[in-house]
């Protein structure tokens, strides 16, 4: 089973069914359909999946049977286009069905919605969930796949199978426990948080491929895998990068069966050749397939070889740099990136890519100059400010985080980003700033050598969320510019933005600052989101408000909520005290 297997199969659908097995086949088709038709009811998707599965079985029995030679896109697209309510539910997406493959699939991909208008998932009582799990385990787990896939249309499908396996294990264990809730709820919280993080990481991979092309993704992969596998040869890293690129291209393109199959092959290859790749893979390679693939993807960096020579001799001091570069530009730059990355597990991937880009730009300029060697001799000096910028930023922000704690650090970022891009919707600013703020608890605890790769690569994932949400309804030229100009310079671009002086403050609307007793029954997290939403709105009304003014208003607001939630007549308290608070805030901010 090599990379070009499909040529040998008369029926692609039969081939994938046999490779993956019925259970994974059905799960992946369900994920694919739910990621395309995000508004369709669960029962409709199950029906479509069952029809596809029955058809696949006929092809397994006889690969020459009618329609079995059709591509998966043709088969799945034809099936999706049988949905009766396509025009009413999806509007112009129905026009995709008039197209032929491959344009039809491209059309479906373009209509994936990163922020679908779907109700928030509310977690039922534990007993209710356990009853549903025991009554029909298969339906219960399919529902999980469906609900996650439709809300996260770029979720990495083979990884979602791993999440579903853990979800099932949690219910199997906890629904028999003495204290079901104490057992189950922390596991579900962990799966939810990990799932959101996994979705966001994959969304960046797909954006990288779709917006910046295969070369950009491959460069990212060379840098990351060279850090992770510093003992591996460049050709080994290159082979892994090629295969990984194929896997992610397939998943991001909606080819989930091929993606899952190729990911399994890649895990198999890595484990068969771990001696040439990394000493850290042993435990991963003893696990079953889904756990194995997940484990490999998260494996810690191997130790750096002890005797790595200086790079300056061959990449700067040598007179042959331009000759070598001219002979095979991408191989030479790939080697430079590999050599630099394996020596620097302490750098973020995006920093390594900035250094490689600087090196490439210098060679392009200098190799055409009269004295190339003289021209590129100082190229490594140009790296210093590029390295120091994220180092200083992380130092400052970790100090601020340690001083303020997560909630107040998020608030500082909310104010900072609302002033930078006040046109962005309040829910997006709250979501993105809250996630940016989580960098503190996630990364500042690490020693210096691990802070930058943790922080800056995490920030790249979060800022990509801003970029994909903003792309759906663009409102800020500054956001568009930072998102589209350079993938690796997104974070520095946003960091460099100052207060938007062109912004006309939002009209004051008392309704925005009217609160009710329902806030008292919210979880701490939901209450924080309410307060942070108010903070963004305040800044939109008064972008020139000082930190002190905003802090005073927010402190008053927190006291107001605490007071009214303790009152006997909460609703009356919120109505009366709320009016006073609005008036006092207006006065304090000069509104």
């Amino acid at each position: 089973r090599g990379v070009f297997r499909r040529d040998a199969h008369k029926s692609e659908v039969a081939h994938r069914f046999k490779d993956l097995g019925e259970e994974n086949f059905k799960a992946l088709v369900l994920i694919a359909f739910a990621q395309y038709l995000q508004q369709c009811p669960f029962e409709d998707h199950v029906k479509l999946v069952n029809e596809v599965t029955e058809f696949a079985k006929t092809c397994v029995a006889d690969e020459s049977a009618e329609n079995c030679d059709k591509s998966l896109h043709t088969l799945f697209g034809d099936k999706l286009c049988t949905v009766a309510t396509l025009r009413e539910t999806y509007g112009e997406m129905a026009d995709c069905c008039a197209k032929q493959e491959p344009e039809r699939n491209e059309c479906f991909l373009q209509h994936k919605d990163d922020n679908p208008n779907l109700p928030r998932l509310v977690r039922p009582e534990v007993d209710v969930m356990c009853t549903a799990f025991h009554d029909n385990e298969e339906t219960f787990l399919k529902k999980y796949l469906y609900e996650i896939a439709r809300r996260h249309p770029y979720f990495y499908a083979p990884e979602l199978l791993f999440f579903a396996k853990r979800y099932k294990a949690a219910f199997t264990e906890c629904c028999q426990a003495a204290d079901k809730a104490a057992c189950l709820l922390p596991k579900l919280d962990e799966l939810r948080d990990e799932g959101k993080a996994s979705s966001a990481k994959q969304r960046l991979k797909c954006a990288s491929l779709q917006k910046f092309g295969e070369r950009a993704f491959k460069a990212w992969a060379v840098a990351r895998l060279s850090q992770r596998f510093p003992k591996a040869e460049f050709a080994e890293v290159s082979k892994l990068v090629t295969d990984l690129t194929k896997v992610h291209t397939e998943c991001c393109h909606g080819d989930l069966l091929e993606c899952a199959d190729d990911r399994a092959d890649l895990a198999k290859y890595i484990c068969e050749n771990q001696d040439s790749i990394s000493s850290k893979l042993k435990e991963c390679c003893e696990k079953p397939l889904l756990e194995k693939s997940h484990c490999i993807a998260e494996v810690e960096n191997d130790e750096m070889p002890a005797d790595l020579p200086s790079l300056a001799a061959d990449f700067v001091e040598s007179k042959d740099v331009c000759k070598n570069y001219a002979e095979a530009k991408d191989v030479f730059l790939g080697m430079f990136l590999y050599e630099y990355a394996r020596r620097h597990p302490d750098y973020s991937v995006v920093l390594l890519l900035r250094l490689a880009k600087t090196y490439e730009t210098t060679l392009e300029k200098c190799c055409a100059a009269a004295d190339p060697h003289e021209c590129y001799a100082k190229v490594f000096d140009e790296f210093k400010p590029l390295v120091e910028e994220p180092q200083n930023l992380i130092k400052q922000n970790c100090e601020l985080f340690e001083q303020l704690g997560e909630y107040k650090f998020q608030n500082a970022l909310l104010v900072r980003y609302t002033k930078k891009v006040p046109q962005v919707s309040t829910p997006t600013l709250v979501e993105v700033s809250r996630n940016l703020g989580k960098v503190g608890s996630k990364c500042c605890k690490h020693p210096e050598a691990k802070r930058m790769p943790c922080a800056e690569d995490y920030l790249s994932v979060v800022l990509n969320q801003l970029c994909v949400l903003h792309e759906k309804t663009p409102v800020s030229d500054r956001v568009t510019k930072c998102c589209t100009e350079s993938l690796v310079n997104r974070r520095p671009c946003f960091s460099a933005l100052e207060v938007d002086e062109t912004y006309v403050p939002k009209e004051f609307n008392a309704e925005t600052f009217t609160f009710h007793a329902d806030i008292c029954t919210l979880s701490e997290k939901e209450r924080q989101i309410k307060k942070q939403t108010a903070l963004v709105e305040l800044v939109k009304h008064k972008p020139k408000a000082t930190k002190e003014q905003l802090k005073a208003v927010m402190d008053d607001f927190a006291a107001f909520v605490e007071k009214c939630c303790k009152a006997d007549d909460k609703e009356t308290c919120f109505a009366e005290e709320g009016k006073k608070l609005v008036a006092a805030s207006q006065a304090a901010l000069g509104l």
């Epitope: 040869e233 460049f234 050709a235 080994e236 290159s238 050749n273 040439s276 070889p305 005797d307 790595l308 020579p309 790079l311 001799a313 061959d314 990449f315 040598s318 042959d320 000759k323 070598n324 002979e327 095979a328 191989v331 030479f332 790939g334 080697m335 050599e339």
Partner: nanobody, 125 residues
Framework: HVQLVESGGGSVQAGGSLRVSCVAS????????MGWFRQAPGKEREGVAS????????FYTNSVKGRFTISRDNAKNTVYLQMNSLQPEDTAMYYC??????????????????WGQGTQVTVSS
């Protein structure tokens, strides 16, 4: 066209040392991955050590780590293999090979494009 010429082989007692050399002519960046392979009678050819002549990174098969050292002198277009603490099982014909750094893998001789004629190393107990 790349030409590789090995020298320095010979016979030595167990525990002794030898240094073999490989001079490359017509070498380019796309043949800047240089390796040493060996083949004992009746056995498959196996990778011993490799070096990127641009970058200088080195790789070794497990059985020679700590005993053998590969190095280069780019000015002389020469790659060396210093072999210390030689054992009888190191007896083999030693071949120099060159290939593209994007393709060459020490565990796979087919990923190297150019080969020398070989030099015999014999270690007696």
């Amino acid at each position: 066209h790349v030409q590789l010429v090995e020298s320095g082989g010979g016979s030595v007692q167990a525990g002794g040392s030898l240094r073999v050399s490989c001079v490359a002519s017509g070498n380019t960046y796309l043949t800047s991955c240089m390796g040493w392979f060996r083949q004992a009678p009746g056995k498959e050819r196996e990778g011993v050590a490799s070096i990127y002549t641009v970058g200088g990174s080195t790789f070794y098969t497990n059985s020679v780590k700590g005993r053998f050292t590969i190095s280069r002198d780019n000015a002389k277009n020469t790659v060396y293999l210093q072999m210390n603490s030689l054992q009888p099982e190191d007896t083999a014909m030693y071949y120099c090979a060159a290939g593209s750094p994007a393709r060459c893998r020490l565990r796979d001789p087919t990923t190297f494009d150019y080969w020398g004629q070989g030099t015999q190393v014999t270690v007696s107990s």
